[in-house]
């Protein structure tokens, strides 16, 4: 099985024990590590920040002692914006220039492939996204002709039904991608006005969301029905939780909220907590399991957080094995307890290790 793990470059800027550099990563933990994100500048792939090149070097030296590790560079992301990707993908010359710039950049900096993180193609971009993937793959094949190992091509895709329908021709893009990471998290957010888990495995009777699509099981099944081969589908598992501020004394699933949860001490983003911050939060909190959804949530005061723990990730791995998927994807290594100092287990990357162990179990 693949264990595809994202590392986010901005994690370096978190203060104190939250600061994570690539040399803190475990070279034997994941089969693939994806560095997020690269930029596109003047239609060429480029670093996002000047110090990225230093971090590329740190990441890729992990392969010195684990030659089986593969590293990919993810281009795009939320800050890049869909419009910029759209302009490049829809213009034949811009697309060509971008595609041509990728192999030398990846080779130079020691990467084994490219991950496309176009978040998200609009309805009019659907065909352009397919073309971009098809032409990128063709370039990778051509570039590998002189006996080089072919560069890998993957994409991170939304797990939301509405986005899947408008953005992706799943059957066509699957032909050209080496693997597809489906982002089976962020199904529920503060915009709903109520508490709810952002990454439930199943819908479950407790699901207060207004649709039956906002869960991992539906998203995976839908992708498979649309023509994604199970052998290329990698299922996303978050090492972060989504938090809410409760608006009343109600604390269950579907309780009214006044907004996102208070920012974490290190991640400093309202409504999001890294797993290592959740471990801190759990001291003195009340933990509940949403049985049907097979995921936990915790409450403390007026704060509510839905997250994944070692038990829930094992359930998710069992599920992906039952569906014969290619493996698991983790967002993100730097949100796990990468130092092993927060979650009281004297173990670095406890969630990712639990996923790895479950994938290896017979």
């Amino acid at each position: 099985y693949k264990l595809v793990c994202y590392y986010t470059s901005w994690s370096q800027y978190r203060e104190g024990d939250g600061s994570c550099f690539p040399d803190a990563l475990d070279r034997f933990l994941c089969t693939h590590i994806i560095y997020s994100f690269a930029n596109i500048s003047n239609d060429h792939i480029d670093t996002w920040e000047w110090n990225d090149v230093t971090l590329y070097g740190m990441l890729n030296t992990l392969k010195n002692r684990n030659p089986n590790l593969k590293t990919l560079l993810s281009v795009g992301g939320w800050n890049f914006g869909s419009q910029r990707f759209s302009k490049i993908a829809s213009n034949t010359q811009s697309r060509r220039t971008f595609i041509k710039s990728v192999p030398p950049f990846l080779r130079t900096h020691g990467f084994d492939g490219l991950d496309l993180a176009w978040l998200y193609p609009g309805r009019r971009d659907k065909q352009h996204f397919t073309t971009l993937i098809k032409e990128m793959k063709a370039e990778f094949i051509k570039e590998a002709q002189p006996g080089k190992k072919q560069l890998l091509l993957s994409a991170a895709l939304s797990a939301g039904k509405v986005t899947i329908d408008s953005s992706y021709d799943i059957a066509k893009i699957s032909q050209h991608l080496d693997f597809i990471s489906i982002m089976t998290y962020d199904f529920h957010g503060a915009w709903r006005g109520t508490t709810g888990h952002h990454s439930p495995l199943f819908r479950g009777q407790e699901d207060a969301s207004p649709d039956r699509f906002s869960n991992t099981d539906y998203a995976v099944g839908y992708m498979l029905r649309l023509g994604a081969p199970a052998s290329k589908l990698v299922m996303g598992i978050p090492t972060f939780g989504r938090s809410f501020t409760l608006a009343s004394s109600e604390t269950g699933v579907g309780a009214p909220i006044s907004g996102p949860g208070i920012p974490g001490r290190f991640t400093k983003e309202a409504g999001t907590l890294a797993y290592y911050e959740i471990c801190d939060f759990l001291r003195g909190a009340t933990v509940h399991r949403i049985l049907g959804q097979q995921v936990p949530y915790a409450t403390k005061g007026n704060q509510w957080v839905g997250y994944d723990d070692q038990e829930s990730v094992k359930s998710k791995v069992q599920y992906l094995k039952d569906r014969q998927l290619a493996g698991a994807m983790v967002w993100a290594l730097d949100l796990d307890d990468f130092q092993g100092s927060f979650c009281g287990q004297d173990l670095r990357f406890p969630l990712t290790n639990a996923i790895k162990d479950a994938l290896a179990a017979t």
């Epitope: 500048s41 060429h44 000047w50 110090n51 090149v53 590329y56 740190m58 080779r107 130079t108």
Partner: antibody
């Protein structure tokens, strides 16, 4: 083997112009940002300017902003520094350096620019 | 701009000595601190990047440590070829700035 060879230095009068070149070899020039760093005689190092791999991002030290222009030609594996309105305090050895994330991992041998009347 | 201050500005040492040079940033620069060696008439050479990562080909007697504002370059056993001037440089934010240098001389 990475090689950076600067040229174009020399004696110039205050207010004059010079264009420095840096010929690069031994690495994929088009995939790396590049820098100019200078060193006045008997003094320390001062970063001057930087240009990203695709020329999309350019930075200058305040001391040269508006007077110096950095550029590159990826097809020729060459980095340039156009220096206008030169002053006596611009007298220095100018080094081009390969970027390793705002770390200067390879340097040329330098070219001396003397601004004097 | 971030100011980098090295100390001492010069030091005399003998072959075999353990030598320590410090560098202080005027504000936190995380691990974005690099060390260079320069010999007279030559270009600088990168020794250490990201505070503690040894550049390829650099002898292991050179090591770096520190984070935030205070950093150290250590030469565990000074060799004849190590007599030179050493500069620290921050790569945290533009303009990228250097310390004023530390000259290591033969005692």
């Amino acid at each position: 083997e990475v090689q950076l060879v600067e040229s174009g230095g020399g004696l110039v009068q205050p207010g004059g112009s010079l264009r420095l070149s840096c010929a690069a070899s031994g690495f994929t020039f088009s995939s790396y940002a590049m820098h100019w760093v200078r060193q006045a005689p008997g003094k320390g190092l001062e970063w001057v300017s930087a240009i990203s791999s695709s020329s999309g991002t350019i930075y200058y030290a305040d001391s040269v902003k508006g007077r110096f222009t950095i550029s590159r030609d990826n097809s020729k594996n060459t980095l340039y520094l156009q220096m206008n309105s030169l002053r006596a305090e611009d007298t220095a050895v100018y080094y081009c350096a390969k970027d390793f994330g705002a770390v200067f991992d390879y340097w040329g041998q330098g070219t001396l620019v003397t601004v004097s009347s | 701009d971030i100011q980098m201050t090295q100390s001492p500005s010069s030091l005399s040492a003998s072959v075999g000595d353990r030598v320590t040079i410090t560098c202080r940033a005027s504000q936190s620069i995380s691990r974005y601190l690099n060390w260079y060696q320069q010999k007279p008439g030559k270009a600088p050479k990168l020794l250490i990047y990201a505070a503690s990562s040894l550049q390829s080909g650099v002898p292991s007697r050179f090591s770096g440590s520190g984070s935030g504002t205070d950093f150290t370059l250590t030469i565990s056993s000074l060799q004849p070829e190590d007599f030179a001037t050493y500069y620290c440089q921050q790569s945290s934010s533009t303009p990228w700035t250097f310390g004023q240098g530390t000259k290591v001389e033969i005692k």
